[in-house]
C-alpha cells in the first residue's frame, strides 16, 4: 500500500515512515498490515487466500510379485529403478483412473520381498469449505481400488498375466496427510500484534480476515460520523467535529451542538 508525496515536505516524510515502512524517493512503501502517508494506519482487512487447491498424501505399501528384487532397484538413478517406476506408475494410473482427485504416485523406497514398494499416492482438490470431506472420500476410494487390484491381479502358477501382480496380504496404508488450511490461524498470524481483534467471516464461501473497522460485516463497528481506527488496545472510534457539532462517545453517537455550548459560556460570563 503506497501514498505518494509531492513537494518540499517530502524529505521530512521520508524519515518519518512508521511501522517498518520504507521511503522509495516519492512515498512510504508500507508493509502488508499498514497504509497511510506515513504507514500510520492499520488495514481493516487482510487477504488470506484461500489457496486454489488443497493436497493430500497417502503413504502406501504394496508387494509386487511379478518382479524379482535385484540390487539395482535400491539405486533410484539406475535404469532398472527408472523402468520399474515407469511401469508401476502406469499400473497405478490405471488403478486410480476415475478418481478426479488423483494426481500420481511417488515411489519412496523399494525393498526385498518380491518387490515391496513404499510409495505415496498424491491427491489434490480445488479449495471449498468441504475440501476435507472431498479428500476423505477420495482416500477411501483409493483404499478400495488398491485392495481390489491387489486381490485380483495375482500370480497363477508363478506367472502373471497382468502388467503387474501383487501379494494380496502385502497392501498397507501407513499414513494419510492432508494439507491443513486454517483461515482463523492464518488470519491471527497475519494480523500479528493485532491478532486478537481480527476475525474470519465468510461471504460466498470465501473467508475474509477483517477487523471491526471493516464495514459491511457482522462484527463491523459503527462509528457513525466518526472514523474507526485500530490500535494495540483494539478498534476505536475517532470522533469528528463539524461546523455545528462536537461528537463524542464510544461510537461517536453523542452530538453536542456548538451554539448551545458557546451560548452557555456567554451566559456564564
Amino acid at each position: 500500500r503506497t501514498t505518494t508525496c509531492f513537494g518540499d515536505g517530502c524529505q521530512n516524510t521520508a524519515s518519518r515512515c512508521k511501522n517498518g515502512g520504507t521511503w522509495d524517493g516519492l512515498k512510504c512503501q508500507c508493509p502488508n498490515l499498514y497504509y497511510g502517508e506515513l504507514c500510520e494506519e492499520v488495514v481493516s482487512s487482510i487477504d488470506i487466500g484461500p489457496p486454489e487447491t488443497i493436497s493430500a498424501q497417502m503413504e502406501l505399501t504394496v508387494t509386487v510379485t511379478s518382479v524379482k528384487f535385484t540390487e539395482e532397484l535400491k539405486n533410484h538413478s539406475s535404469q532398472e529403478f527408472q523402468e520399474f517406476k515407469q511401469t508401476f506408475t502406469e499400473q497405478m494410473n490405471i488403478v486410480y483412473s476415475g478418481i478426479p482427485e488423483y494426481v500420481g504416485v511417488n515411489i519412496t523406497k523399494l525393498r526385498l520381498g518380491s518387490v515391496v514398494v513404499e510409495h505415496d499416492v498424491l491427491l489434490r482438490t480445488k479449495y471449498t469449505p468441504e475440501y476435507k470431506t472431498v479428500l476423505d472420500n477420495a482416500t477411501e476410494v483409493v483404499k478400495e481400488k488398491i485392495t481390489k487390484v491387489t486381490t485380483q491381479q495375482i500370480m497363477i502358477n508363478d506367472i502373471c498375466s497382468d502388467m503387474m501382480c501383487f501379494n494380496t496380504t502385502g497392501t498397507q496404508v501407513q499414513n494419510i496427510t492432508v494439507t491443513q488450511y486454517d483461515p482463523e490461524e492464518d488470519c491471527r498470524k497475519m494480523a500479528k500484534e493485532y491478532g486478537d481483534y481480527f476475525v474470519v467471516e465468510y461471504r460466498d464461501q470465501k473467508p475474509y480476515c477483517i477487523s471491526p473497522c471493516e464495514p459491511g460485516f457482522s462484527v463491523s463497528k459503527n462509528c457513525n460520523l466518526g472514523k474507526c481506527q485500530m490500535s494495540l488496545s483494539g478498534p476505536q472510534c475517532l470522533c469528528v467535529t463539524t461546523e455545528t457539532h462536537w461528537y463524542s462517545g464510544e461510537t461517536c453517537n453523542q452530538g453536542t451542538q456548538k451554539s448551545l455550548v458557546y451560548g452557555h459560556h456567554h451566559h456564564h460570563h
Epitope: S66, E72, M155, C160, M164, C165
Partner: nanobody, 123 residues
Framework: DVQLQASGGGLVQPGGSLRLSCAAS????????MAWFRQAPGKEREGVAF???????SYAESVKGRFTISRDNALSSLYLQMNSLRAEDTAVYYC?????????????????WGQGTMVTVSS
Amino acid sequence: DVQLQASGGGLVQPGGSLRLSCAASGFPSSRGTMAWFRQAPGKEREGVAFINSDGRTSYAESVKGRFTISRDNALSSLYLQMNSLRAEDTAVYYCAASLLYLMTVNAAAYPYWGQGTMVTVSS
C-alpha cells in the same frame, strides 16, 4: 539406447520348424528378461515365452513342448526354436525386453520392442 531386431520368419508347412532370432543392442545381456510375443491377424498380442537373466523360462500353454526359448548373453541374442508348427501359429512374432527380472506375459510390462517378423504356417 536399447534396440531389438527380430529375424528368421517365413513360410513353412504344418509340422515344419523355424528358428527366430533377435539381436539386442544397448541391452545389458546378463540382466533382465527377454520375451517373444505374437499377434495373429485380428487378434490381441499374446505372450509366447520369456526367459530371465538366470535362464528361468516360461511358456504359453499352446506352445509348451513345441517351442524353446534361449538366450546367448555373449552375443546379446534371443532365440525361439519352433517345432511341430501348426496353422494357428501363423502370426507376426515380436521380441521384447525388460531390464527387470519379470514373471509376466503381459506386453505392457515390456518397454523395449523389436519390429515383427512374419511366420506363416500353410500347406
